[in-house]
Interface confidence: low
């Protein structure tokens, strides 16, 4: 016998469905109604004949009372083929919902997103979370999704996207975002960053994560947020291979004051890098290649230091830094 | 721990007003929505009103009669009833949709606080 593709926990605080069948019975989601977190995976499912069985054009305002009831804040949505007309309906629908946050993760979008109804209203999410999802517009993505939300959101992260650049001339401001994670999109680069970054788009940024994006100096990303008008107040620059050296041909660049907390962890930094904000409230250093203590003059003023899982420290040994967080214990790193 | 305090309840007379409050004692969480739920015996919880990004919801029923505020600094929402009927004696609940301030995942969590009775009677 097949498994239930749904599953609700004993609290209907969080469903999971796993759709795998070639011809998978929809209905069996209806289970999901009570549940604060749902999950749907289509098994890698292309939904275009879905499209034949609804209307996507249909009003959405006959299902709001419905919809309105749903306790539904977390969605996610998984491996599909899903033509831009069909999540254009979903996300009509969902409008009436209370949905906060919503995922969408190894998804391909094929065809246009058309453009907002006047009478449509957006969906008033706190959290967008993309991850491996592709679009047929390319650049444009962004643009044409943005028209469909209300201009609340406070989280936005992409990651593995096929074009991680976006068309900023036609991207419009992003108010109340305040944190922003481009993380594991190794491909991105300094450049890329600065293609990302649209100017003045990003005006409210407080937290922006860049793990794994193929960054190559802080200066380099001091330049690009600097190009871009971005004041963060912590960066996560970790899990990138760092050169500690600064071309010396490159202008000098300076940091925001506003920025507060560096993340340089799991960067293989053999040194400081050069080039580091004059002061900080938190710097992490940790898990890097660092074969002996950072002399004062190296660093920044920091409040909070750690250098965990660096080779010159063993167990036992004098702190190096005043008000460092080291465990003296060396991490798995 | 995140609590919520409802006050305001008790009974009135048809046509009469009362104002319900409800505080949020918070710190660590940001609020997204607020809003007020009732649930009449022998009646499911059904959404009375909700401040919900930026704008506001209102059961058909209460549409014109009841006005949901809120004031920020105080970390407390309001529900002014006016008119009042008799359909309107319930159990008032205060709901609250909190999200982690810090980063991601962008924690949510939903809260209820304990319920003030309010009746209405004819």
């Known amino acids: 016998t097949t498994p239930e593709p749904c599953e609700l926990d004993d609290e209907d605080f969080r469903c999971v469905c796993n759709f795998s069948e070639p011809q998978p019975d929809w209905s069996e989601a209806f289970q999901c109604v009570s549940a604060v977190e749902v999950e749907i995976h289509a098994g890698g499912l292309n939904l275009e004949p879905f499209l034949k069985r609804v209307d996507a054009d249909a009003d959405p305002r006959q299902y709001a009372d419905t919809v309105k009831a749903l306790r539904v804040r977390r969605l996610t949505v998984g491996a599909a083929q899903v033509p831009a007309q069909l999540l254009v309906g979903a996300l009509r629908v969902l409008a009436y919902s209370r949905l906060k946050e919503l995922t969408l993760e190894d998804l391909k979008i094929t065809g246009t997103m058309p453009p907002l109804p006047l009478e449509a209203t957006g969906l008033a999410l706190s959290s967008l979370r993309l991850r491996n999802v592709s679009w047929a517009t390319g650049r444009s993505w962004l643009a044409e999704l943005q028209q469909w939300l209300k201009p609340g959101l406070k989280v936005l992260s992409i990651a593995q996207a096929h074009s991680p650049a976006f068309s900023c001339e036609q991207v419009r401001a992003f108010p109340a975002l305040t944190s922003l994670d481009l993380s594991d999109n190794p491909g991105l680069g300094e450049r890329g960053l600065m293609a990302a970054l649209c100017p003045h788009k990003f005006p409210a940024i407080q937290n922006l994560a860049l793990r794994n994006t193929g960054m190559e100096t802080p200066t380099g990303v001091c330049a690009a947020l600097a190009a871009a008008g971005v004041q963060p107040h912590s960066l996560d620059l970790s899990h990138n291979s760092l050169r500690a050296t600064v071309n010396p041909s490159a202008p000098r660049c300076m940091w925001s004051s506003a920025l507060n907390s560096l993340n340089l962890s799991f960067a293989g930094l053999e040194q400081v890098p050069k080039g580091l904000p004059a002061k900080l409230r938190v710097l992490d250093l940790s898990c890097n290649r660092l074969n002996r203590a950072p002399q004062p003059d190296e660093l920044p003023e920091v409040d909070n230091l750690t250098l965990d899982g660096n080779p010159f420290l063993v167990p036992g040994t004098a702190l190096p830094h005043e008000g460092s967080m080291n465990s003296g214990v060396v991490p798995a790193c | 721990q995140v609590q919520l305090q409802e006050s305001g309840g008790g009974l009135v007379q048809s046509g009469g007003s009362l104002r319900l409050s409800c505080a949020v004692s918070?710190?660590?969480?940001?609020?997204?929505?607020m809003g007020w739920y009732r649930q009449a015996p022998g009646k499911g919880r059904e959404l009375v009103a909700e401040?919900?990004?930026?704008?506001?919801n209102y059961a058909d029923s209460v549409l014109g009669r009841f006005t949901i505020s809120r004031d920020n600094a105080k970390n407390t929402v309001y529900l002014q009833m006016n008119s009042l009927k008799p359909e309107d004696t319930a159990v008032y609940y205060c709901n609250a949709d909190l999200t982690g301030s810090s980063w991601y995942p962008y924690r949510f969590l939903e809260v209820w606080g304990q319920g003030t009775q309010v009746t209405v009677s004819s």
């Open positions: 918070v710190s660590i969480f940001s609020i997204v929505d």
């Open positions: 401040l919900s990004g930026g704008s506001t």
